[in-house]
Interface confidence: low
Amino acid sequence: PPRGRILGGREAEAHARPYMASVQLNGAHLCGGVLVAEQWVLSAAHCLEDAADGKVQVLLGAHSLSQPEPSKRLYDVLRAVPHPDSQPDTIDHDLLLLQLSEKATLGPAVRPLPWQRVDRDVAPGTLCDVAGWGIVNHAGRRPDSLQHVLLPVLDRATCNRRTHHDGAITERLMCAESNRRDSCKGDSGGPLVCGGVLEGVVTSGSRVCGNRKKPGIYTRVASYAAWIDSVLA
């Protein structure tokens, strides 16, 4: 089943997010991802936990998962590099780099997204865009076309309240509000974009969606700049 957790959003403008990737297992959407270099897609490490014996591929240039689109192309994965400290039972270090079998053919609908290298928290209240093909309602309906939602960044202290995530949000993680609008199952690995720059990756822990007391958790890419650079080098 798709991993992760867009509720309360709307259909995205077609191909307006050319960095958006669908990480697929045996031809079906599993997780979101974001093109960060011509041959590399960043996603969430836990996404591959369900992929023990399947074919992992990456779909780029897509709006609809099912309809033919001239910009769509499915790439095989040459190499999967989960963060060395990621573990199945924690949300920490939940990052995965997928090296495509060849450099992506770039164009208006396929383009890497600049990612944040300055290790500083995004200001609380900043509106950030999260997109994905994750479920759109609590009944588990999966969309065919890319969805997105704008979410305000939530300060870490609030996110760490006992009633919220109870101290689990380290400096390497960030939160966004989840009051009826939220990332949800199948959005894991997708991008949280603030001011046109990749700031976070949707974590893939199992979490109730759309509940304001359980904010969305995102891995801060700036905190992992050294690791990302070392893999992409």
Epitope: K55, V56, D76, L78, R79, S101, E102
Partner: antibody
Framework: EVQLQQSGPVLVKPGASVTMSCKAS????????MNWVKQSHGKSLDWIGV????????SYKQKFKDKATLTVDKSSSTAYMELNGLTSEDSAVYFC????????????WGQGTTLTVSS | EIVLTQSPALMTASPGEKVTITCSVS???????LHWYQQKSGTSPKPWIF???NLASGVPVRFSGSGSGTSYSLTISNMEAEDAATYYC?????????FGTGTKLEIK
């Protein structure tokens, strides 16, 4: 213990085809890609291609695209390579080698199958 | 296709001698994608060093690997008779995977 057991040596005539096998044991066959590598006598190693045993998906080095066909039988955890239109240039030792999505180097090698093409 | 050129092609070393084999890559690759294999006559290659500098299981600590970009090397700090073999570098950076030309190391 991981093992890749390859079929025995083969002597064939030019123009013929041959299929060699590689039986895997000691691990879940579908969880790792299977590669094939050619080594001509006294020469270096030449990667032929790779197959994903789960899906049957393949990728070949350009010069082997019309020469080699990679297949698997999941039920017996066996990988196969068929070589067609054989010439003396195809005389070599052929290795099946584990490695792929979950292993980014060639970690286990079969013992090799020696192919001799001679009239 | 990425071409890997090893030097020297053949070398002879005395026991206890320091040995360095180099691998020149035609275009820059990630150090995590450069590996070394050891092959003795009549046997299959064995993984020896992976990701430029990580020794495979059972490889003596007198072996080490280093490098980045287009230049990589394998070093034996004190040559021993059992190290006589052919060594190949290999890249996992992009399809098609390619191997180096090989370095045959003999003992004096």
């Amino acid at each position: 213990e991981v093992q890749l057991q390859q079929s025995g040596p083969v002597l064939v005539k030019p123009g013929a085809s041959v299929t060699m096998s590689c039986k895997a044991s000691g691990y879940t066959f579908t969880e790792y890609y299977m590669n094939w590598v050619k080594q001509s006598h006294g020469k270096s190693l030449d990667w032929i291609g790779v197959i994903n045993p789960y899906s049957g998906g393949t990728s070949y080095k350009q010069k082997f695209k019309d020469k080699a066909t990679l297949t698997v039988d999941k039920s017996s955890s066996t990988a196969y390579m068929e070589l067609n239109g054989l010439t003396s240039e195809d005389s070599a030792v052929y290795f099946c080698v584990r490695g792929g999505l979950r292993r980014n180097y060639f970690d286990y090698w079969g013992q090799g199958t020696t192919l001799t093409v001679s009239s | 296709e990425i071409v890997l050129t090893q030097s020297p092609a053949l070398m002879t070393a005395s026991p206890g001698e320091k040995v360095t084999i180099t691998c020149s890559v035609s275009s820059s690759i990630s150090s995590t994608n450069l590996h070394w294999y050891q092959q003795k006559s009549g046997t299959s290659p064995k993984p020896w060093i992976f990701g430029t500098s990580n020794l495979a299981s059972g490889v003596p600590v007198r072996f080490s690997g280093s490098g980045s970009g287009t230049s990589y090397s394998l070093t034996i700090s004190n040559m021993e008779a059992e190290d006589a073999a052919t060594y190949y570098c290999q890249q996992w950076n992009s399809y098609p995977f390619t191997f180096g030309t090989g370095t045959k190391l003999e003992i004096k």
